[in-house]
């Protein structure tokens, strides 16, 4: 590895109203020549490591979280690994970790607050 992948998320919690959609922002800086085939992206619940959503082998592997999550596929190649969580519920409140692996890896946690 040449150095950790820098993963950036907002410092402040994302606040969402019950029933609305929330975007958990996560970004990384792709190196020149980066291709989506190299990308392993995993969103997980921070506390339990339960899989929420993943992208690997060049394709979106889909939601593992009640089919309420989606990536922004057209923006992934530019380093936007954000996750859309639809129809937010009270039980969704907590910390989500964005794990990005290319040749090396990095991760960061973002908090969701439900109002």
């Amino acid at each position: 590895p040449t150095g950790a992948v820098e993963v950036q998320v907002p410092e402040d919690p994302v606040v969402a109203l019950v029933g609305t959609d929330a975007t958990l922002r996560c970004s990384f800086s792709p190196e020149p020549g980066f291709s989506l085939a190299q990308l392993n992206l995993i969103w997980q619940l921070t506390d339990t490591k339960q899989l929420v959503h993943s992208f690997t082998e060049g394709r979106d592997q889909g939601s593992a979280y009640a089919n309420r999550t989606a990536l922004f596929p057209d923006l992934l190649a530019q380093g936007n690994a954000s996750l859309r969580l639809q129809r937010v519920r009270v039980a969704d409140e907590g910390s989500f970790t964005c794990f990005v692996s290319i040749r090396d890896f990095g991760s960061a946690a973002v908090s969701l607050q439900v109002a």
Partner: antibody, heavy 116, light 108 residues
Framework: QVQLQESGPGLVKPSGTLSLTCAVS?????????WNWVRQSPGKGLEWIGE???????NYSPSLKSRVTISIDKSKNQFSLKLNSVTAADTAVYYC?????????WGQGTLVTVSS | EIVLTQSPGTLSLSPGERATLSCRTS???????LAWYQQKPGQAPRLLIY???SRATGIPDRFSGSGSGTDFTLSISRLEPEDFAVYYC?????????FGQGTKVEIK
Amino acid sequence: QVQLQESGPGLVKPSGTLSLTCAVSGGSISTSNWWNWVRQSPGKGLEWIGEIYPTGNTNYSPSLKSRVTISIDKSKNQFSLKLNSVTAADTAVYYCARGWNYFDPWGQGTLVTVSS
Amino acid sequence: EIVLTQSPGTLSLSPGERATLSCRTSQSINGILLAWYQQKPGQAPRLLIYGASSRATGIPDRFSGSGSGTDFTLSISRLEPEDFAVYYCQQYGSSPRTFGQGTKVEIK
């Protein structure tokens, strides 16, 4: 390239506190990664102990949670492990490692023996 | 916690032979959440495979990983002298992260 190096006493008395430090070189400990402790008892397998994020957030193994504290010192580019009320069962090689999911790289490990 | 069971405990093979190591998980996990490590005596573990099938940086292509659900496999197509070691699988789909008990690949 990130490298890790464990240091600390190789012998701890029963009921005492095991204290180890992991120095990170070749990169900043403030990067977006979790920093872990894993141990391996003599002739046995690997056991994850816990981890810390640069913000200070921690996660611990449920079986050790009541006895473990992991801290981070960003100014010294290092993180530390404290395990209290140790017994002979805590005798192991202790490794530090980088990673949130899988671990890479690892330190070379340091043997800690619990004995009077 | 998820328990990982590796088999066989020991595999006795000759250089040039193919090695097939098994890792079973007590609960089904997504393949993206499994890794393999190699450990030689007196050394720290070394990451070989992550995401069940992706080789880590610098790992030769004779190492390959596969599997899904509860059954995962690490294959070494042609054993080189430096491949004789202990191999561990590890899951990261549930906390705490857990390891298998290891498979020792020894020279026959």
